[in-house]
């Protein structure tokens, strides 16, 4: 049979066909039925729901739908022993206390199994001692403190605000400065839209809305007691002192009617400049310690908080493909959520729901894809991406073999503006082409496509006419997939205007007040942006499964590289005397650019002229397709970061939520200035870019003709 | 309708003691601080205690420090204060009332909500 | 926590305008922004008609207002109308976390 004739693809089943069958109004009544509880990670609520999901998928029509568990790191609080901080007085009163829990949202006041705000993996401890504010606790904000302002938080109990970057790099770098404790708190200048009330009137958060979070620093390891190997029966688990990530100093946080109690009393040095200021009616002082009257006064901080291994399920579901069941597809999202999961990630896991149900009704129409479609609902991805890691781990070599692609569906929604989408440069033409071919939800747009919509309002910085497609960081279950396996991944959600909200994510982000409400009546009624994201994922997981040639464009790649190594070099050339002084050149790199850009040229034109009808050549560049990103993989990993694999892109390691550019070089750069041994310091910077070079000529190879 | 209403005054004996309830509804009061405040017979008002929604916090007037406790059951969405060691001078018509603000930590940005008071004799 | 210190009375004619005083110390009115008043009819419980010094609760009439200056705040109504008559009280946070009254004004409208 012909590769159309074996996947059944007449005009009934085609894209339109499985585009046409998702409704809002199904995703709508998924969302209600997936936030009524909680579904924290480890618990049985959890379990039950991974249970109904696989019930439910397995009537939906996949072939299989199975759950794997592992028995993993979590972290929860102590239920008779709760955390908080005080201030005590000179004789050890405490005379304020921080909340033990937030004021629960109209109609969820009998809730049970409300987990109270926490830091996920802190360690237990009582420090007290001095405050100082450290803003948002960046690399540069330390850098501010302890370089020009000549502050010292070594023994200090630091209080940072949330947002610019990953909790779990605030911590670190907290942890670097000889902080004692940290206290994390959302300051409305980053929570709090001007104009829009807080919840339950509005999507803003009320001054007792707490976001919750991990704090570890895995770098990609998984479950932190079997860092590169599953957490299954028969797992050699590290003892606690040699786990991966996990921080030394207690950690808890707060919201800003606490915060305010807190900073209010805060005296020593003024805020360095008005960037350091949020919107309290506190004067942000840096401190170290409180003012005047109440400089006899201190911070203690309760942390109690225990780290138990506990057994955790994915939903892995499989809808084979009919002509090349050994090539994966994978459309995954988590299912844990830290309360209510509102947004995070139940619009995900609703729209995730409704593809797969779509998809099931095309195939009991007697339609497969070419390719296999996994579906994963993944477990404990708020405690590290512990679910999908460790499936991940305990598949690699499948993974590595048979891995086409990597969709990611978390949260649906963080706005309801536009489009945001962030995936490898292989996927731009495949984004670009199926919202061309979407129709936009957007007010304003009516009968005009999503890309129209999408490039008006996010319009690429470097190319016009076309929208702005992020680079891949982290945070998020695609991590293993795109960073550790190198296997193409994406993902596409809608978002907020970020020209004009300057907060941090959206503003309940893991608090309780993630609810269904909350989705329903403030930031998609209709579900109409639901539905976009549904058709943007499930139309890339159905091109991506069922094109005869793979939608991945190398091109692409190599203008990206070109602009990447513009940029590091220009970084670079911030030292021309140190560049000079130890031999640093880049024409490596360029060169290898060069060679990239020119092979990829010649691999798209055989790909117009290949004859497709011959399944070992169409078989073979689809090959050459699917393993160009497993091609920019180091089996070494970056420099402390084995994990993190990809040469051209890893997690920031001042942020793991954003992406960084040939990292190793990166990294090897950033504040060379301040190295002690600079001879060394510009020698790695060579070995990085040999590496890159290497790297980057290594991929452009596996696109010449074979033979 | 929003409603605080006060239940168990009484008169009663010095030194002995007596338990205040005050059953809220018509609003979420598992996220509202509350208070009690007092006033004696033809004088004026004296504030007495409050209770932090989730009862991390307590403040009492120094007048009935060690002697009175306040507490709170959000699942029966009730207030209570427990009187101790009661004088003749914590004769008073108790009121209970809401803080203005939902979830919040510093209870004095007013008190919207009163109830209509139970009254407290304590005589020999 | 002493009482703050109020004026025991205070009188005006319909239409007229009347101030009532509010004094403590810094360490309550003059060192936090929460000072609050109430209205109390003989034998109803206090209603709140201004809270953090200046603001109005839905509900209350413009014609009250509120201001602070240095450790005394002050509660003006303006147009006073026979309904007015009644008992005001302010109270204040203090340093200690607790909250004081003042001793009441009674305002009569001749």
């Known amino acids: 049979k012909s590769s159309n004739e074996a996947t059944n693809i007449t005009p009934k089943h085609n894209m339109k066909a499985f585009l046409d069958e998702l409704k809002a109004e199904n995703i709508k009544k998924f969302l209600y039925n997936f936030t009524q509880i909680p579904h924290l990670a480890g618990t049985e609520q959890n379990f039950q729901l991974a249970k109904q999901i696989q019930s439910q998928w397995k009537e939906f029509g996949l072939d299989s739908v199975e759950l794997a568990h592992y028995d993993v790191l979590l972290s929860y609080p102590n239920k008779t022993h709760p955390n908080y901080i005080s201030i005590i007085n000179e004789d050890g009163n405490e005379i304020f206390n921080t909340s033990l829990f937030e004021p629960p949202p109209p109609g969820y006041e009998n809730v049970s199994d409300i987990v109270p705000p926490f830091s996920a993996f802190s360690p237990q401890g009582m420090p007290e001692g001095d405050l100082v504010y450290v803003n948002y606790a960046r690399t540069e904000d330390f850098f501010k403190l302890e370089r020009d302002m000549k502050i010292n938080c070594s023994g200090k109990i630091v209080i940072a605000r949330y947002g610019k970057v990953f909790r779990g790099n605030k911590v670190k770098n907290a942890q670097l400065a000889g902080a004692k404790g940290v206290i994390l708190y959302s300051d409305p200048a980053d929570y709090f839209a001007p104009g829009v009330k807080s919840y339950p009137d509005g999507w803003n958060l009320p001054g007792g809305g707490v976001q919750r979070g991990n704090i570890l620093n895995l770098n990609g390891a998984g479950d932190p007691l079997t860092p590169g190997y599953p957490a299954n029966e028969y797992a050699y688990r590290r003892g606690i002192a040699e786990a991966v990530g996990l921080p030394s100093i207690p950690v808890h946080p707060i919201g800003y009617y606490d915060a305010q109690k807190l900073l209010e009393k805060m005296g020593g040095s003024a805020p360095p400049d008005s960037s350091w200021r949020g919107s309290l009616k506190v004067p942000y002082n840096v401190g170290p310690g409180f003012t005047g009257n109440f400089s006899t006064q201190k911070v203690k901080m309760h942390i109690h908080s225990t780290n138990e291994v506990t057994r955790i399920y994915n939903v892995i579901g499989t809808l084979r493909g009919a002509v090349e069941p050994d090539r994966y597809v994978i459309l995954g999202g988590h299912r844990d959520s830290w309360v209510f999961g509102g947004i995070d990630p139940q619009s995900g896991a609703a729209v995730v729901h409704e593809i797969v149900r779509s998809f099931g009704t095309l195939k009991k129409e007697g339609w497969r894809p070419r390719r296999t479609i996994l579906f994963a609902s993944w477990d404990a991805e708020e405690f590290g991406l512990l679910g999908s890691t460790e499936w991940a781990e305990e598949n690699s070599r499948l993974l590595q073999e048979r891995g086409v692609a990597y969709i990611n569906a978390d949260s649906s929604i963080e706005g309801n503006y536009t489009l945001r989408v962030d995936c490898t440069p292989l996927m731009y033409s495949l984004v670009h082409n199926l919202t061309k071919e979407l129709k936009s939800p957007d007010e304003g747009f009516e009968g005009k496509s999503l890309y129209e919509s999408w490039t008006k309002k996010s319009p690429s910085p470097e190319f016009s006419g076309m929208p702005r497609i992020s680079k891949l960081g982290s945070g998020n279950d695609f991590e293993v997939f795109f960073q550790r396996l190198g296997i193409a991944s994406g993902r596409a959600r809608y978002t907020k205007n970020w020209e004009t909200n300057k907060f941090s994510g959206y503003p309940l982000y893991h608090s309780v007040y993630e609810t269904y409400e909350l989705v329903e009546k403030f930031y998609d009624p209709m579900f109409k942006y639901h539905l976009t994201v549904a058709q943007v994922r499930g139309g890339m997981v159905f091109e991506l499964a069922n094109s005869i040639v793979l939608p991945f464009d190398c091109r692409d790649y190599a203008v990206v590289l070109r602009k990447y190594a513009d940029k590091i070099y220009s970084i670079s050339m911030k030292h021309p005397q140190e560049m000079k002084t130890y031999s640093v050149s880049f024409d490596s790199l360029f060169s290898a650019v060069k060679n990239f850009t020119e092979i990829a040229s010649k691999f798209s034109e055989r790909l117009q002229d290949f004859d497709k009808s011959n399944p070992i050549v169409l078989r073979m560049m689809n090959d050459q397709l699917m393993f160009l990103e497993r091609a920019f993989i180091d089996p070494l990993g970056l420099p402390d970061r084995p994990f993190y694999r990809h040469v051209i892109y890893a997690p920031s390691s001042h942020n793991k939520y954003a992406g960084e550019s040939f990292p190793g070089i990166y990294d090897a750069l950033f504040d060379i200035e301040s190295k002690v041994d600079p001879s060394k310091a510009w020698g790695e910077v060579k070995r990085q870019i040999y590496v890159a070079a290497f790297t980057v000529q290594a991929a452009a190879e596996t696109l010449s003709e074979v033979a | 309708e929003v409603q605080l209403v006060e239940s168990g005054g009484g008169v009663v004996q010095p030194g002995r003691s007596l338990r205040l309830s005050c059953a809220a509804s018509g609003f979420s009061f598992s996220g509202y601080g509350m208070h009690w405040v007092r006033q004696a017979p033809g004088k004026g008002l004296e504030w007495v205690a409050v209770?932090?929604?989730?009862?991390?916090?307590?403040y009492y007037a120094d007048s009935v420090k060690g002697r009175f406790t306040i507490s709170r059951d959000n699942s029966k969405n009730t207030l209570y204060l427990q009187m101790n060691s009661l004088r003749v001078e914590d004769t008073a018509v108790y009121y209970c009332?809401?803080?203005?603000?939902?979830?919040?930590?510093?209870?004095?940005?007013?008190?919207?909500?009163w109830g209509q008071g139970t009254t407290v004799t304590v005589s020999s | 926590q002493s009482a703050l210190t109020q004026p025991a009375s205070v009188s005006g004619s319909p239409g007229q305008s009347i101030t009532i005083s509010c004094t403590g110390a810094s360490s309550d009115v003059g060192g936090y922004n929460y000072v609050s008043w109430y209205q109390q009819h003989p034998g109803k419980a206090p209603k709140l008609m201004i809270y953090e010094v200046s603001n109005r609760p839905s509900g209350v009439s413009n014609r009250f207002s509120g201001s602070k200056s240095g450790n005394t705040a002050s509660l003006t109504i303006s147009g006073l109308q026979a309904e007015d008559e009644a008992d005001y009280y302010c109270?204040?946070?203090?340093?200690?976390?607790?909250?004081?009254f003042g001793g009441g004004t009674k305002l009569t409208v001749l």
């Open positions: 209770i932090s929604y989730d009862e991390s916090n307590k």
């Open positions: 109270s204040s946070y203090t340093i200690t976390s607790t909250l004081v």
């Open positions: 009332a809401r803080d203005r603000i939902w979830g919040s930590r510093g209870y004095y940005y007013g008190m919207d909500v």
